[in-house]
Interface confidence: low
């Protein structure tokens, strides 16, 4: 069901954002720089 797929996808997106914020806060500029250089 497309709505279910979309909902699940967005839920994962929310979680990814939370993880990204956590990593940015904990690792700071080093994390951002590493991502940039990949």
């Amino acid at each position: 069901h497309s709505d279910g797929i979309f909902t699940d996808s967005y839920s994962r997106y929310r979680k990814q954002m939370a993880v990204k914020k956590y990593l940015a806060a904990v690792l700071g500029k080093r994390y951002k720089q590493r991502v940039k250089n990949k």
Partner: antibody, heavy 117, light 110 residues
Amino acid sequence: QSVEESGGRLVTPGTPLTLTCTVSGFSLSTYNMCWVRQAPGKGLEWVGFINSDDSAYYASWAKGRFTFSKTSTTVDLKIASPTTEDTATYFCARYDWDYYYSRLDLWGPGTLVTVSS
Amino acid sequence: DIVLTQTPASVSAAVGGTVSISCQSSESVYNNNYLSWFQQKPGQPPKLLIYGASTLASGVPSRFEGSGSGTQFTLTISDVQCDDAATYYCLGDYIIIENIFGGGTEVVVK
């Protein structure tokens, strides 16, 4: 940390208009930014947001009428073809979320757009 | 379309009294708690009071309390002060990547 909108002015219907939100003290690579508008004497209306990865999401009524874009320190809202119904104060706000909450925690003072012939 | 119904539209309160504002959603907000409350005074931007349905924003007096989950939420202002005269809005954040404001409640302090 601050947010400030600019670019609001009197325009005639159909004249494209771009509003700019300038942020300082935090990074747009970490935070999402949201646009909210308020017609004179009316309630708040959510327009949409642009996320930290540059993807834009719009309210169902706003799709096709507004476009968001951003640089490292600014977020733009473009009204392609304004109508008199777009007359409002436009607010830019930092849209922060975690898995456990969502919040619009930092607002600009707003910029007034008047659409009139 | 999702509807977020705020009641009452206007309420009068005496200084020292208590005010309750209800916010009912036609669908559950994201995570059952992605609901915020804002205070707005004329000529000013909205000010965040409560987020996550019940978490007090920084610098907001503990007289403000948020409760509820899913589709039904309440903002309670205890020991009402003159400075609390304002319009209050709830904001729901939904799985469909849409945020909806309630219609607002004007609080008049006598």
